[in-house]
Amino acid sequence: DGCKDIFMKNEILSASQPFAFNCTFPPITSGEVSVTWYKNSSKIPVSKIIQSRIHQDETWILFLPMEWGDSGVYQCVIKGRDSCHRIHVNLTVFEKHWCDTSIGGLPNLSDEYKQILHLGKDDSLTCHLHFPKSCVLGPIKWYKDCNEIKGERFTVLETRLLVSNVSAEDRGNYACQAILTHSGKQYEVLNGITVSITERAGYGGSVPKIIYPKNHSIEVQLGTTLIVDCNVTDTKDNTNLRCWRVNNTLVDDYYDESKRIREGVETHVSFREHNLYTVNITFLEVKMEDYGLPFMCHAGVSTAYIILQLPAPDFRAY
């Protein structure tokens, strides 16, 4: 069918509560495109009827609510004027109950479930609620160890819990709860968050910063050798992994047989407040199949991509 397949990360979700996933894949979805959702390679698109428990809402797939049988691989097909991409999203549903907020043992957990507060600082936790505009979210309540949080040090501000003067005792299991309204029906959303405390505020907080690349394209001739650095700043005591991936697979694994594209050895320079890490990707020979494919640099929760592009023809040579 001429569509290019892209495999996204697994999403691990909670049964009996709403869930939504937005089909966006920069730079593909930045122009005029049509998006259609399918389940498990079905030829029949997901319903667009808003009364359906599972339906497509603009570029989103919306589950109201998620159920056990909803686990599986969902595809969203993005059709542009000259392109077609099929994005595969693996959704795994597990049963999470009220106050079951310690979910660190689950595989591939999103970092939304694991957050850090900085000792002695004013900091915040975020309740990640990703839903389309048709969903109206009520005020958020916050819990710790199954009890509602209160006290002058805690302030709820939109989707955040502000914690002033963070102490070691603020570690533990939190949950944020909101009521979602859609088409006159109400649903409860409950997200568990495991919170740890770190003593260092570090360089720019706890999230690694990718200095380069910056989600851009690189013009490169077919058949040439190309080396691209990923430069990352991070705290000195960080435990983040830095790597290059393509189609959500480590490049060394993806090109295991040909070894045509490889990840380099990581190096770092130590500064007083932070470290600067560099890990490169080497294309021994750029092939046609490499063009238009996002090569992602990952650093903890941060990502940035490059896309190889054929140079525009130079008409001055003719």
């Epitope: 009220w98 310690s102 160890d145 199954c146 209160k150 006290g151 005792e169």
Partner: antibody, heavy 116, light 107 residues
Framework: QVQLVQSGAEVKKPGASVKVSCKAS????????MNWVRQAPGQGLEWMGM????????RYAQKFQGRVTMTVDKSTSTVYMELSSLRSEDTAVYYC?????????WGQGTLVTVSS | DIQMTQSPSSLSASVGDRVTITCRAS??????LNWYQQKPGKAPKRLIY???SLDPGVPSRFSGSRSGTDFTLTISSLQPEDFATYYC?????????FGQGTKVEIK
């Protein structure tokens, strides 16, 4: 570090009341619930109730409802547990336990003996 | 109210033995369960928080796990200082409830 220091042992007559104190230090007192747990001689642990120092909200176990009163003095970071209409089966060690993270820290215990 | 059924009520073991203590909740409590060690005349000391998180300073021979509403405390290699009484506590919903306790004695 976190410390919960309780008042000393008490001997009471049946029908009387006892008030046990628990002074907290080393953490933000008004941010977390404080629980009371008791243990009769040679027996297991029994949750009595809890209080939040921020707004004095209380939750009591059904068994102690009407007999127990938990109060707080924010100025001294102290929580109090008063048990009235004492009977011999109330003879126990009474502990306060903070819920900074669920029942993380415990006081040293206060022995209350009810005897005629 | 949620009942916590702890077993065995007592056990005799030798230094170096692997010891397993179980608590069963009468209804779902998620991971909201702690394990405590208590020695005579002392306050309980928390060993494990939220089913499986080891408290700071607690030896790694202690571990906690869960299967549905069954919770297990395991001591991989019993040491002389481990002879004590162990309790589980559910804090998923009040009234909070403890298991009846397991006394670990020297064989």
């Amino acid at each position: 570090q976190v410390q919960l220091v309780q008042s000393g042992a008490e001997v009471k007559k049946p029908g009387a009341s006892v008030k046990v104190s628990c002074k907290a230090s080393g953490y933000f007192f008004t941010s977390y619930w404080m629980n009371w747990v008791r243990q009769a001689p040679g027996q297991g642990l029994e949750w009595m109730g809890m209080i939040h120092p921020y707004d004095s909200e209380t939750r009591y176990a059904q068994k102690f409802q009407g007999r127990v009163t938990m109060t707080v003095d924010k100025s001294t970071s102290t929580v109090y547990m008063e048990l009235s209409s004492l009977r011999s089966e109330d003879t126990a060690v009474y502990y306060c336990a903070s819920s900074t993270t669920a029942f993380a820290y415990w006081g040293q215990g206060t022995l209350v003996t009810v005897s005629s | 109210d949620i009942q916590m059924t702890q077993s065995p009520s007592s056990l005799s073991a030798s230094v170096g033995d692997r010891v397993t203590i179980t608590c069963r909740a009468s209804q779902d409590i998620g991971n909201a369960l702690n394990w405590y060690q208590q020695k005579p005349g002392k306050a309980p000391k928390r060993l494990i928080y939220a089913t499986s998180s080891l408290d700071p300073g607690v030896p790694s021979r202690f571990s906690g796990s869960r299967s549905g509403t069954d919770f297990t405390l395991t001591i991989s290699s019993l040491q002389p200082e481990d002879f004590a009484t162990y309790y589980c506590l559910q804090y998923a919903s009040s009234p909070y409830t403890f298991g009846q306790g397991t006394k670990v004695e020297i064989k």
